[in-house]
Interface confidence: medium
């Protein structure tokens, strides 16, 4: 997270960590005792190591009461996912055993009604994803609030020009945004998971390329079909 | 199939004012700003400014700012310019396009005479 | 604002043969931004060249774009007939976007 500041520990307990080989890889969201959503490029970047989920936790590095890691039963990426393309950028990540809630842990509800969140709406983004341009790295937890970009903008030529489809949405990025580390994150707006930071090598914090993040709303079928 | 539909020639006396409409289909209006140019015979294209569908909000080049109007109708799915205090420095073909010019419209040929 | 200027305005061209068309910008354009089209007459312009090198859809391979900086160029590796059209240079590095005033391709 570019340009945030050190989240309340443990106000986001749907929060996860994807982890390889014990490693921060991206962000992902609690959506169901045993599911966790995140972004399907994340798994690419895992080669054959092995996947984790942790959950509960606000720092990486530091023990918590509330911290475990859940190994990883079976990955679900989107069906119309593609290594060249942001489109479809979601993975559903199935947990070995319910995880055990608590008010560290807790499944986030998202939306389901397809419609796309008012433009200028400020929505919460948290990841321990890269800090810097230099890319430092957080042990805890970031968060930044952005304001949804409508997408024509975010489409213009000198944005993502044309890139971004009905099942994505922007959020603004001049100087803060969601970076390296962040991808699979949820993107929150009035208490619902309304997006999930895609995992595309974008280049952060510049204000003429918005933040990409896909629409959970536009994947309900999807989603539901997985979970059931 | 992206269509951008512009309406016929108009003729037009100095002075005067004319709105020319643009109606899109084959796509998401709101998904894309609506660009408008201006091609004078043997001259250059020039960039008249866009609209954001969404809000309405434009972006005009400098030397067109009092003389174009950009508005739209996002029930109809159209855009609209307005040219006003017409002179014959504004007989041209005006274009309409979107996706930043991945489309056209085929253009409104706008001839200013007395 | 940036102007684009388009070298030769009229060039007049045997089919087989290689056409080279440039596009000289006052000052610097990202590579990003500089786009060509194709018109023909009584047609409005189409998207032929993105990005500087980015053939758009439906655009035969004999066409490439390539360029940095100030300097921009169209080539096709063997003029064909249906290639005899109007090409215009458009950048939008910069506002306001700006248009060149076309090379007009002529068949021998």
């Known amino acids: 997270i570019l340009g945030g500041r050190e989240a309340e520990a443990h106000a986001r307990p749907y929060m996860a960590s994807v982890q390889v080989n014990g490693e921060h890889l991206c962000g992902g969201v609690l959506v169901a005792e045993q599911w966790v959503l995140s972004a399907a490029h994340c798994l690419e970047d895992a080669a054959d190591g092995k996947v984790q989920v942790l959950l509960g936790a606000h720092s990486l590095s530091q023990p918590e009461p509330s911290k475990r890691l859940y190994d990883v039963l079976r990955a679900v990426p989107h069906p119309d996912s593609r290594p060249d393309t942001i489109d479809h950028d979601l993975l559903l990540l199935q947990l070995s055993e319910k995880a055990t809630l608590g008010p560290a842990v807790r499944p986030l509800p998202w939306q389901r009604v397809d419609r796309d969140v008012e433009p200028g709406t400020l929505c919460d983004v948290a990841g321990w994803g890269i800090v810097s341009h230099a890319g430092r790295r957080p042990d805890r937890l970031q968060h930044v609030l952005l304001p949804v970009l409508d997408r024509a903008t975010c489409n213009r030529r000198t944005h993502h020009d044309g890139a971004i489809t009905q099942r994505m949405m922007c959020a603004e990025s001049n100087r803060r945004d969601s970076c390296k580390g962040d991808s699979g994150g949820p993107l929150v707006c009035g208490g619902v998971l309304e997006g999930v930071v895609t995992s595309g090598s974008r280049v952060c914090g510049n204000r003429k390329k918005p933040g990409i993040y896909t629409r959970v709303a536009s994947y309900a079928a999807w989603i539901d079909s997985v979970l059931a | 199939e992206v269509l951008l539909q512009q309406s016929g020639p108009e003729l037009v006396k100095p002075g005067a004012s004319v709105k020319i409409p643009c109606k899109a289909s084959g796509y998401t209006f709101t998904d894309y700003d609506m660009d408008w140019v201006k091609q004078s015979h043997g001259k250059s294209l020039e960039w008249i400014g866009h609209?954001?569908?969404?809000?309405?909000?434009?972006i005009y080049n400098q030397k067109f700012k009092g003389k174009a109007t950009l508005t739209v109708d996002k029930s109809s799915s159209t855009a609209y310019m307005e040219l006003r205090s017409l002179t014959s420095e504004d007989t041209a073909v005006y274009y309409c396009?979107?996706?930043?010019?991945?489309?056209w419209g085929h253009g409104t040929l706008v001839t200013v005479s007395a | 604002q940036i102007v684009l200027t388009q070298s030769p305005a009229i060039m007049s061209v045997s089919p087989g043969e290689k056409v080279t068309l440039t596009c000289s910008a006052s000052s610097s354009v990202s590579s990003s931004y500089l786009y060509w089209y194709q018109k023909k007459p009584g047609s409005s312009p189409k998207l032929w060249i993105y990005?500087?090198?980015n053939l758009a859809s439906g655009v035969p391979a004999r066409f490439s774009g390539s360029g940095s900086g100030t300097s921009y160029s169209l080539t096709i590796s063997s003029m064909e007939a249906e290639d005899a059209a109007s090409y215009f240079c458009h950048q939008w590095s910069s506002y306001p976007p700006t248009f060149g005033a076309g090379t007009k391709l002529e068949l021998k």
């Open positions: 396009g979107t996706g930043d010019f991945a489309y």
């Open positions: 609209i954001n569908p969404n809000n309405g909000g434009t």
């Open positions: 990005s500087t090198s």
